[in-house]
């Protein structure tokens, strides 16, 4: 028998520095977690103790903090190289800055193979990107070899900016021939490493003949055997065992997100490459694990540029940006409109001639807007200003909801109106009218939404049975501020870009902004 240790991360989302327990900015260092310096310590400890170790990443290193905003992926290559990652799969967020923003900082600089079997380049891009990412790679480990095949969510064109010269194929269809090729090369230990979410990971384990282990990402799935060490609630045991269609037991793993855990899976193979046993658990990277001093010093060196960036002007406002709780928790506020407009703008994807865009709607809890921005400071808007407005380090995500769920959400928005509570919704691509004289749960008297399948966008009444795409904060997608109906009834959820980054990019693009209060939210006469 031959034993392999798989160390794995996924959805790190630019958390190069240690974070608080909820993966936001580290405040009290003695209670902070994760970060590449701490990850390095644990990886080094395991590599020194065990003979056959692979360190893998299942995608979405890009996007999530000011590190990515400033360094645009160069930081990913630099620190992953320093940790000596063995392979990485492409995630959807790796395309956030377009294909060039993937090629130059990451694909050309990474010392490790970057993989995806279901992304096919065409046209002029095919020769430019040739060899920079691969469908699979065979890695020597000790005296054996292990094949790694990559895959990426086929929804990436809707979630990011891969352009028109990359085709995202069905994962299972694309993986099978590559695994077959590895088998003909006498590679009998094969790991599928990818970024399509836990449901697809399980399908790959079930359907792709020859895959021995699946290491996934995208859905931020936390698996654990035994008592979990932090706040995350396990979605199942680690590893999650899937019985394949050909009768094999295939371990499937994921390691939550944000570099908070290091996945740790031990696999025992027989001489024919069959999995005999698998066991392990994610390792919580808490403060009991010291940060490596040399990596930490490197982080501090790179950090200097971030501090300079946060005070630079992104753009100007010529109007007061009203982000006060007195406004945003009671009525339409122009800060809410600005943020929602930025959220929609960030999700412009012209992928189909039938649709002007795939999504037109935004909702945003008023309680998530934490500060106004005064235009009387020469109109200057900085990252620092935006960090005061959006201090929680969240993301603006894409969900699919039925009209009936949206109606419930808007009823919840005003079910206890007047108490300055955070659930009052700011909107984009939506016109809502409330009648507060009616009883809670029946206060939405008009709800019109902007069409997407149209050449001239216009507002139509919401249809209860129709499925709509909506951009919203991850906080709401996870049921925050009492929006349990969104969490319980959403049909799809894909995590998006860092909130501050979305707004800062929009302001930089527009250069001068002047958002107005324009009648998106109204109260019917006599009730307000």
């Amino acid at each position: 028998a031959w034993e392999l240790t798989i160390l794995h991360t996924n959805d790190v989302h630019s958390r190069l520095e240690q974070t608080s327990e909820d993966s936001s900015k580290c405040v009290n260092a003695s209670r902070c977690m994760g970060g590449v310096a701490r990850l390095f310590t644990k990886v080094q400890q395991i590599r020194r103790a065990e003979p056959n170790v692979l360190l893998l990443d299942a995608g979405d290193q890009y996007q999530g903090t000011i590190w990515f905003t400033v360094y645009k992926g160069a930081e990913v290559a630099h620190f992953m190289n320093a940790l000596r990652y063995d392979a990485m799969a492409l995630g959807n967020h790796e395309f956030d800055n377009g294909v060039e923003g993937l090629i130059e900082p990451l694909l050309k600089e990474a010392k490790f193979p970057i993989l995806s079997a279901n992304i096919k380049a065409k046209g002029p891009l095919a020769s430019q990107i040739s060899g920079l990412y691969l469908p699979y790679k065979v890695l020597p480990v000790g005296d054996e070899v292990v094949g790694i095949v990559g895959y990426t969510s086929k929804e990436t064109p809707f979630l990011s900016n891969p352009g028109t010269n990359l085709v995202f194929e069905d994962e299972i269809t694309a993986l099978q021939p590559e695994v077959d090729k590895l088998k003909t090369l006498n590679v009998n230990k094969i790991i599928a490493l990818g970024h399509s979410g836990f449901e697809m990971d399980k399908l790959i384990a079930q359907k792709v003949r020859g895959v021995d282990v699946v290491v996934g990402g995208h859905s931020n799935t936390f698996l654990y055997t035994g008592n979990p060490p932090s706040k995350e609630v396990p979605a199942g045991k680690y590893p999650f065992i899937v019985t394949s269609d050909d009768g094999r037991k295939v371990p499937v793993v994921q390691a939550y997100a944000f570099g908070k855990y290091l996945g740790y899976l031990k696999i025992e193979f027989d001489e024919r490459g069959n999995v005999i046993s698998s066991h392990g658990n994610p390792i919580l990277l808490n403060s009991s694990i010291p940060e490596d001093p040399s990596i930490k010093a490197d982080i501090n060196k790179w950090r200097i540029k971030l501090d300079n960036y946060s005070t630079q002007e992104l753009g100007k406002t010529i109007v007061y940006l009203d982000g006060s709780s007195q406004s945003c928790r009671f009525r339409e506020c122009n800060m809410g409109n600005l943020i929602c407009d930025a959220m929609i703008n960030n999700n412009l994807r012209h992928t189909d001639e039938m649709f002007w865009n795939h999504v037109s709607m935004c909702i945003l809890n008023g309680g998530g807007i934490r500060s106004p921005i005064d235009e009387r400071n020469n109109g200057t808007i900085t990252w620092e200003n935006l960090a005061a407005v959006l201090p929680f380090g969240g993301t603006f995500d894409l969900v699919q909801l039925k009209g009936s769920t949206l109606k419930k959400a808007f009823e919840h928005s005003v079910h206890r109106y007047g108490q300055s509570t955070g659930e009052f919704l700011q909107v984009g691509g939506i016109h809502v009218v409330y009648d507060l004289s009616r009883k809670p749960g029946d206060r939405v008297v008009k709800l019109d939404v902007l069409c997407t399948k149209c050449r001239v966008p216009s507002y139509d009444p919401l249809k209860m049975d129709e499925v709509y795409k909506v951009i919203l904060p991850n906080f709401l997608a996870n049921g925050g501020d009492g929006f349990q109906m969104i969490k319980d009834e959403l049909l799809r959820h894909d995590s998006g870009d860092q909130d501050i980054n979305v707004v800062s990019t929009y302001i930089s693009k527009m250069k001068v902004i002047y958002p107005a209060v324009e009648g998106r939210i109204k109260f019917s006469t006599g009730s307000h």
Epitope: N81, A82, K111, G131, L134, V138, N186
Partner: antibody, heavy 121, light 111 residues
Framework: QVQLVQSGAEVKKSGSSVKVSCKAS????????ISWVRQAPGQGLEWMGR????????NYAQKFQGRVTITADESTSIAYMELSSLRSEDTAMYYC??????????????WGQGTMVTVSS | QAVLTQPSSVSGAPGQRVTISCTGT?????????IHWYQQLPGTAPKLLMY???RRPSGVPDRFSGSKSGTSASLTITGLQVEDEADYYC???????????FGGGTKLTVL
Amino acid sequence: QVQLVQSGAEVKKSGSSVKVSCKASGGTFSSYAISWVRQAPGQGLEWMGRIIPIFGTTNYAQKFQGRVTITADESTSIAYMELSSLRSEDTAMYYCASDGAVAAYDAFLIWGQGTMVTVSS
Amino acid sequence: QAVLTQPSSVSGAPGQRVTISCTGTSSNIGTGYDIHWYQQLPGTAPKLLMYRFTRRPSGVPDRFSGSKSGTSASLTITGLQVEDEADYYCQSYDSGQRGWVFGGGTKLTVL
């Protein structure tokens, strides 16, 4: 950018051992792999083995297994290659080499100046 | 006997184009292990010329290019110059040998 500076030439008796050093300066020594490659007079290059100092992991070419030992001292940024049971065929230029800043772990961007080891009977 | 096979010598006149082949097997190039190329001028240490089949380190002129097909790789030099006269080596991993291997080397003579 890292530079590799090797110890001086050695003349050794057949059956003895030689230990060649390779000092890294001007970069992060420990995160790179250090390989040892030799070249007999008028012959081609031959990979002997490597070490990743941060992990202490080593790989050796089958031909040299049991006869070569590669070690590294992170505190001094020095890698060592010791070859035992020397014979005349071991007379060669011995190079240490590293990936450095190039985007591949196993490509040798940075080379030491070489250490000539002569084995006399 | 080297695991990767290279012609022992090639030659060309200044300005011409020459190609050096590196033939392997399914246990090295055929498996997709990277090929790197080195140039060794007389009396000096080797210099990395091309890595991962087609990529040039900074400072290497674009007259040098690499390619791969099946179990073979090749290095092409266009617009040959006198200073290109040197020995050239390919390198890969070999799963049978369980280690990194070099080709036997090719002596390029500029006529």
